[in-house]
Amino acid sequence: IPVIEPSGPELVVKPGETVTLRCVGNGSVEWDGPISPHWTLYSDGPSSVLTTNNATFQNTRTYRCTEPGDPLGGSAAIHLYVKDPARPWNVLAKEVVVFEDQDALLPCLLTDPVLEAGVSLVRLRGRPLLRHTNYSFSPWHGFIIHRAKFIQGQDYQCSALMGGRKVMSISIRLKVQKVIPGPPALTLVPAELVRIRGEAAQIVCSASNIDVDFDVFLQHNTTKLAIPQRSDFHDNRYQKVLTLSLGQVDFQHAGNYSCVASNVQGKHSTSMFFQVVESAYLDLSSEQNLIQEVTVGEGLNLKVMVEAYPGLQGFNWTYLGPFSDHQPEPKLANATTKDTYRHTFTLSLPRLKPSEAGRYSFLARNPGGWRALTFELTLRYPPEVSVIWTSINGSGTLLCAASGYPQPNVTWLQCAGHTDRCDEAQVLQVWVDPHPEVLSQEPFQKVTVQSLLTAETLEHNQTYECRAHNSVGSGSWAFIPISAGARTHPPDE
């Protein structure tokens, strides 16, 4: 570690005196610069000497000497006071720049340590400090304003009491810069725009920043637009606003618009799309199939997507029949706006009844005209089965009628004994009717089919069962011949 002679740590001299500071180390040593021109610097073997023949108040400061070759990087320091009765302060810098919440060092150095008790910090021309200004003083370094605030960016003077009067330093300008957390905040409205050719349009790009040094521009595709900006200050932020006002839009105005703002922290951009159309439009679509099948008693939501410009002037859901003249309850119709030009309309149909099958139409209107989208709703029913004994052309015949949707298929079973329902162990014979006769098949209604089982003689100790099934479920009816005739019954529920 180098050593300074005289040993210090402080040296007090009068103006005009000769001062010699010698730094000695094991190897070569050097003084931390910059050294003012008033000093002469020369090397003397392993030592470095600073000397001045005419000390002035401006030589007041700390002088530090280091030994570059020292692995420990040690240094020695001495603080020189040149106590000038006329000049109590040596100001090392006239401007200090810090960020908010940093400590700001105002480097006015006292030229006479005896004056330390009577020092104070004031604003220019002796004005008092702002409230809540927290500061401390070090005779070697000056005044420190702790955790400086933006509002404390002012001109300051250091004051010392000399012979009962206050003597001021030259002024020091403190600039406190706001900490910029990131690029400016942006808004671009609207987020999306559609206009008919010839209509007016407006796009507003605005940016806000914690300080005034930032730029903002609006570009169309890649072209920066010549828009005069409007400036404002509110909510403790600087605002810059660009308003693009188009009196009569044309197709060349369509495209991507980007609002771009930048500051020292970087760039931020946001975009929107402007569509110019020849005329009003109204498009209805659904992600669902327009032909819907639902099991009776279940619920269904019918959903329609609408894209329209200009906005809708009217819309409604209508039941077109065929069963009743009821109309969907308004409370079951729901509208949600996805964005300015796209909407979703939902009709909720809970616990569907047979009379609610049929066509449901969504109608919408705007200046482009009327549009409709129609759903066809068919209800699914499990089969209902009945069997009767009849004679056809003199032959005894079992006649099975099955009704349901989708169309049921029919299977006949013969099984041993008298039973309400044939189980697999009892089955003696199975007949599948590949083409039962369709008795009725009306839209939105059950399909009724008929299957015949012709038998010359029905064995008394047997059960004959007609079974029908479709995708919803199954139904059956058992027939038991008895001596007096025949008896039929459905299985127990």
Epitope: T223, K224, A226, P228, S231, S245
Partner: antibody, heavy 118, light 113 residues
Framework: EVRLQQSGPELVKPGASVKISCKAS????????MHWVKQSPEKSLEWIGE????????TYNQKFTGKATLTVDKSSSTAYMQLTSLTSEDSAVYYC???????????WGAGTTVTVSS | DIVMTQSPSSLAMSVGQKVTMSCKSS????????????LAWYQQKPGQSPKLLVY???TRDSGVPDRFTGSGSGTDFTLTITSVQTEDLAVYYC?????????FGSGTKLEIQ
């Protein structure tokens, strides 16, 4: 209809000043930069400068700095140009012109003739 | 400043003829960001203020007859009138709006024979 209506001709003495006006109508005055152009037989068309009607901030052709001062009155949608220390070299037709968003002058005033003569 | 040079300074043509006039700039007017040339052409008829014909070197302004065509890129630009009409008697100016100060050419005077 978008229009820029300029004030009438001016006959002024050397050394004097003149202030000419340009009243905008048919559009949002603060939405576009206003520019001024000088036309003299010797020098063809010369760009003088522009003003942002929102803020009043100006950009001048260095040649006209100190000669021309641009101002606006937003309440009347009027732009002004003051010319000082006039000499015969300042005799010309002066146009105000609206700068379109796409960097061209889409609307021009009819021009104001300034004649400097003793 | 960018210097704009127009040629010829004047020309006399008959109705129906094709007219070509040139404009050269002392530095490129092609903006690398949007690949557009920041050059406009104006027509000034006697006693009138200038009227825009073409911007971005080749985009015809709405309402301008399609006999007027702008072309060129970088530093060399051309205005062509495919079939000149009597009402085309005017002075034609090119102007750069690439950087301030905006500058104009000295004009090409078109006379009809």
């Amino acid at each position: 209809e978008v229009r820029l209506q300029q004030s009438g001709p001016e006959l002024v003495k050397p050394g004097a000043s003149v202030k000419i006006s340009c009243k905008a109508s048919g559009y949002t005055f603060t939405g576009y930069y206003m520019h001024w152009v000088k036309q003299s037989p010797e020098k063809s068309l010369e760009w003088i400068g522009e003003i942002n009607p929102n803020t009043g901030s100006c950009t001048y052709n260095q040649k006209f700095t100190g000669k021309a001062t641009l101002t606006v009155d937003k309440s009347s949608s009027t732009a002004y140009m003051q010319l000082t220390s006039l000499t015969s070299e300042d005799s010309a037709v002066y146009y105000c012109a609206r700068l379109n968003y796409y960097w061209y002058f889409d609307v021009w005033g009819a021009g104001t003739t300034v004649t400097v003569s003793s | 400043d960018i210097v704009m040079t127009q040629s010829p300074s004047s020309l006399a043509m008959s109705v129906g003829q094709k007219v070509t006039m040139s404009c050269k700039s002392s530095q490129t007017l092609l903006n690398s960001n949007d690949q557009k040339n920041y050059l406009a052409w104006y027509q000034q008829k006697p006693g009138q203020s200038p009227k825009l014909l073409v911007y971005f070197a080749s985009t015809r302004d709405s309402g301008v007859p399609d006999r007027f065509t702008g072309s060129g890129s970088g530093t060399d630009f051309t205005l062509t009138i495919t079939s000149v009409q009597t009402e085309d008697l005017a002075v034609y100016y090119c102007q750069q709006d690439y950087s301030t100060p905006f500058t104009f050419g000295s004009g090409t005077k078109l006379e009809i024979q």
